[in-house]
């Protein structure tokens, strides 16, 4: 392992659509992939009238957008579905929205998902 980099071996798993997809609803997911590539965790969620609805959480394949991110933070301004990724075991347990805006100072909206 490279010094200073947290390797991702497992992530929090959640699937709101678990019955249709025939998966578990929640748990811990071991991360697989090519041995030479990095692995990450992700979270996706929706903001329905101020209420946070988690869509999915799990492992994410090698992605430079996720490199060296210890926190799972969505930076895109008002996406339809929020997405963040991070490095480090279970780093997707908490996720937040911190839009990158050019003029106004961004405000953080940390989200700690309630267990289902």
């Amino acid at each position: 392992a490279i010094l200073g980099r947290s390797e991702t071996q497992e992530c929090l798993f959640f699937n709101a659509n678990w019955e249709k997809d025939r998966t578990n609803q929640t748990g811990v997911e071991p991360c697989y992939g090519d041995k030479d590539k990095r692995r990450h965790c992700f979270a996706t969620w929706k903001n329905i009238s101020g209420s946070i609805e988690i869509v999915k959480q799990g492992c994410w394949l090698d992605d430079i957008n996720c490199y060296d991110r210890t926190d799972c933070v969505e930076k895109k301004d008002s996406p339809e579905v929020y997405f963040c990724c991070c490095e480090g075991n279970m780093c997707n347990e908490k996720f937040s929205y911190f839009p990158e805006m050019e003029v106004t100072q961004p405000t953080s909206n940390p989200v700690t998902p309630k267990p289902p």
Partner: antibody
């Protein structure tokens, strides 16, 4: 092993649309992007766009903006690329590829646009 | 994002080394380690050989290596073999906030 299997060759009339599919197996479909690339006869590779398979978020090359739509069906682990207002210059082999590094590719789908 | 620049063709004899260059700008190739190299044989789909400038994709022989200096990335193939004859493309990572772009391709002939 990772496999991307694309739909068969298509012959289309100018002005019509084509929808190419790309079925993924051997990995968790919702754990990466699917990119679409095309290659005209005797020419180089041209990036068209990408989709985040879990969030559905897309980005398109400026050249194809407004004419291409990339979608993903997570229930069947299949990505789709639809190109509209076809012209003869769109005759090409269309490829899907997994992830931001394009580490695994589909076999390609030849789309011929001819009147 | 403008296309990356590659030489049209390069050639070498079996056993020799060849280097293919891929020139971009200080805002893409120069500042980010996100250049990849693909090999394409006639009538086949491209294959990833090198990603992230210098990392070999699984199963790729160590005769293939990648490097970068300034705004130019390079693919070096040492100990050339007949089966290395193909088209080679450089390209960038695509996904999230990154948009993809490819070089024009380089035809490698093994003499």
């Amino acid at each position: 092993q990772v496999q991307l299997v694309q739909s068969g060759a298509e012959v289309k009339k100018p002005g019509s649309s084509v929808k190419v599919s790309c079925k993924a197996s051997g990995y968790k479909f919702t754990s990466s992007y699917i990119n679409w690339v095309r290659q005209a006869p005797g020419q180089g590779l041209e990036w068209m766009g990408t989709i985040n398979a879990v969030s559905g978020s897309t980005s398109y090359a400026q050249k194809f903006q407004g004419r291409v739509t990339i979608t993903a069906d997570t229930s069947t682990s299949t990505a789709y690329m639809e190109l509209s207002s076809l012209r003869s210059e769109d005759t090409a082999v269309y490829y899907c590829a997994r992830g931001g590094w394009f580490d695994y590719w589909g076999q390609g789908t030849l789309v011929t646009v001819s009147s | 994002q403008s296309a990356l620049t590659q030489p049209r063709s390069v050639s070498g004899s079996p056993g020799q080394s060849v280097t293919i260059s891929c020139t971009g700008t200080s805002s893409d190739v120069g500042s980010k380690n996100y250049v990849n190299w693909y090999q394409q044989h006639p009538g086949k789909a491209p294959k990833l050989m090198i990603y992230g400038v210098s990392k070999r994709h699984s199963g790729v022989p160590d005769r293939f290596s990648g490097s970068k200096s300034g705004n130019t990335a390079s693919l070096t193939i040492s100990g050339l073999q007949a089966e290395d004859e193909a088209d080679y493309y450089c390209g960038t990572f695509a996904g999230g906030k990154y948009y993809g772009v490819f070089g024009g391709g380089t035809k490698l002939t093994v003499l």
